[in-house]
């Protein structure tokens, strides 16, 4: 689609005569008829296939024709066409005499023709005017012409439609050849595809407008390059959405079970060595001089009563020192200079001579011990408390302080792991020596029967366009992870593409 423009510039008819030579009366009141048609080697009569246009009376006899385009006037003359410009044409320009104001052919004199010119040739689409002048015996016409494309048409023959737009169907302006030039931030054949935020992940992110980065289900972060782990994942990470890959030292479906209590909590004090011994379970190996479950108690070297025969113990920086009673000597007062004659046995102990009276031994009554029966029996010396329990003397009896997870007089019993009802969905709990086991009802599985196996939301392949399906364990629903170019809960919609185009 385009316009053939004809700019009449000057018409000379000095004698004021018609083509026949007859003078115009009172003068040649001149108007023009223009016929544009297909190329003919010899321009012949017939339909004006490309269009026709007439002017009003522009002047009398000889006159210049002013450019009236700026005021919306008729010069240049416009001959619009609604087809591909063929590059060739034939043009007939007739000058007519109209004695009155009625320019209809039947209202003109029988001999009203002042002049007619016919030209033909090639004409390319362009902004430049071609100037021409046609002279006959009595008249001269100077004019110029050109072909330009209509609004929104481009190319060598005005056949390429391009209408700039900035809406859902495209964001572009038109180049001189009719090709689209995308507005900043848009790309694609019709400039419908927004250019997402720089760095936005190609597969996991998308955008509906430029410089945006919207994440597909299962992804997060400014550039949608961080996966979203399973809902409730505590100490775990993911490489694909809805995973929960446990950090070192953590276990369980949600990585909330502490398998490395030692590292995470450092329970052992005073430089003790910590050993993991199960979920939330540990053992502290104390350095010399410390005791307690967590080696939190400072141990005096004298607490073990190393001095015998009634010797008194004195703590020192580098150990201890025994002050022996009369008749004894040695590091622990273990050597005696006494005999039974000296009544060395205390607390009702019986003395027995040894080595021909050079030595003796005391036989102690119950609750007393020591070489001279000088010590009350310490019921904790035999380490009666099992599973790392701490033994405490309580007068004539003793008591075990048990570590978490154990009970009983001697801490010999595991606290029942089943007491907390850890098995979900009606699972049956069984205590084991080193933990527990759940027997799950039909339709459930997992260490705690927390996984619903009877409903696989992805089994029906609900995701389109080769999307990846994930089952959300907490809601028994599915989540589709769309490939690049698709969106929607089932990845059923191509990104940005409307169902049809208006052109």
């Amino acid at each position: 689609s385009g316009v053939f423009q004809l700019q009449l510039q000057e018409f000379i008819n000095e004698r004021g005569v018609l083509a026949s030579g007859r003078p115009c009366e009172p003068g040649c009141r001149t108007f023009f008829r223009v016929c544009l048609k297909h190329f003919q080697a010899v321009v012949s009569p017939g339909p004006c296939t490309f269009g026709t246009v007439s002017t009003p009376v522009l002047g009398t006899n000889s006159f210049a024709v002013r450019d009236d385009s700026s005021g919306g006037g008729r010069n240049p003359l416009q001959l619009p066409f609604n087809f591909t410009w063929p590059g060739t044409f034939s043009l007939i320009i007739e000058a007519w005499h109209a004695p009155g104001d009625d320019l209809r052919p039947e209202a003109l004199p029988p001999d009203a023709l002042i002049s007619k010119i016919a030209i033909q040739g090639s004409l390319a689409v362009g902004q430049n005017w071609l100037l021409d002048e046609q002279t006959s015996t009595l008249t001269r016409l100077r004019y110029s012409y050109r072909v330009i494309c209509s609004d929104n048409y481009y190319g060598d023959n005005c056949s390429r439609l391009c209408k700039k737009r900035n809406d859902h169907f495209g964001h572009y302006v038109c180049q001189p050849d009719g090709n689209l030039s995308c507005l900043p931030g848009w790309t694609g054949e019709y400039c419908q595809q927004p250019i997402c935020l720089s760095g936005c992940h190609e597969q996991n992110g998308y955008c509906s407008k430029p410089a945006e980065c919207l994440c597909r289900p299962g992804w997060q972060g400014r550039l949608c390059n961080e996966c979203i782990p399973h809902n409730g994942c505590r100490h775990g990470t993911c490489s694909t959405p809805w995973q929960c890959t446990c950090d070192e030292g953590w276990g369980g479906l949600f990585c909330d079970q502490d398998l490395n209590y030692c590292t995470h909590h450092s329970p052992c004090k005073n430089g003790a060595t910590c050993s993991n011994s199960g979920q939330r379970s540990y053992t502290c190996t104390c350095r010399p001089g410390y005791t307690g479950v967590d080696c939190e108690l400072e141990l005096s070297e004298c607490d073990s009563n190393p001095c015998r025969n009634g010797g008194s113990c004195k703590d020192q920086e580098d150990g201890y020192h025994c002050l022996c009673p009369p008749g004894y000597y040695g590091l622990h007062c273990e050597h005696s200079t006494l005999s039974c004659a000296d009544s060395p046995c205390f607390n009702g102990g019986s003395c027995r001579e040894r080595n021909q009276g050079a030595n003796y031994a005391c036989e102690c009554p119950p609750n007393f011990t020591g070489s001279n029966c000088e010590k009350k029996v310490d019921r904790c010396t035999s380490n009666p408390c099992a599973n790392g329990g701490q033994c405490l003397n309580r007068g004539p009896s003793r008591m075990c302080r048990c570590r978490p997870g154990f009970t009983g007089t001697y801490c010999e019993l595991h606290v029942s792991d089943c007491a907390r009802n850890p098995c979900a969905h009606g699972g049956t709990c069984h205590d084991l020596e080193n933990g527990l086991m759940c027997t799950c009802p039909a339709g459930f599985s997992g260490r705690r029967c927390e996984v619903r196996t009877s409903i696989d939301a992805c089994a029906s392949s609900p995701c389109f366009n080769r999307a990846t399906c994930y089952t959300d364990l907490s809601t028994d629903t599915f989540v589709c992870n769309c490939p690049y170019g698709f969106v929607g809960s089932r990845c059923e919609f191509p990104v940005g593409l409307p169902p049809s185009f208006p052109w």
Partner: antibody, heavy 119, light 106 residues
Amino acid sequence: EVQLVESGGGVVQPGRSLRLSCAASGFTFRSHWMSWVRQAPGKGLEWVADISQDGSYKYYADSVKGRFTISRDNSKNTLYLQMNSLRAEDTAVYYCARAAGGNVGFDIWGQGTMVTVSS
Amino acid sequence: SYELTQPPSVSVSPGQTASITCSADKLGTKYVSWYQQKPGQSPVLVIYQDGNRPSGIPERFSGSNSGNTATLTISGTQAMDEADYYCQSWDQSGAVFGGGTKLTVL
């Protein structure tokens, strides 16, 4: 139906006068130029005269100039040709014709009326 | 005065193309009309403004005008086309007719 009907022809002596009439019907007479064209026996067509819509412009062939007068009565839709000083060479069939505007030519013709100038 | 020259006669076989010429100086700058006249009848306009056909005129009639010559062409000539043909234009005094051409369909 568009129609032109001539009348007034006949035999006349040289030097005498004759008035031809042409009755128009079927079109708007006052909107058209009208003409007279004659054809001598066995010869070609010859334009005689024409007249503008309101009668303000009249043109004549050199051969009849000063002797013939073209006129019209738009109220009667009638065209006239007053022929004076007739000559033998004026003998012909005289046609009334509508002269279409804009160099179309004569698009409607009457059946013609014969004028014979003879002594 | 301005003279339009036509050949006195042209013959053509039925179904063939007949061409009748009309010559004058710089005739191509003017418009030419053509008339058909059969014996005992009034003339009929068959071509105006060089090559336009009035309504009712068969398509086999066409015309052209270039340079010094105008041409009436009858393609597929029929017996009913046998007649006298006149070209017509205008000069400073008024309408001018050619001498006429008798078309004979053999």
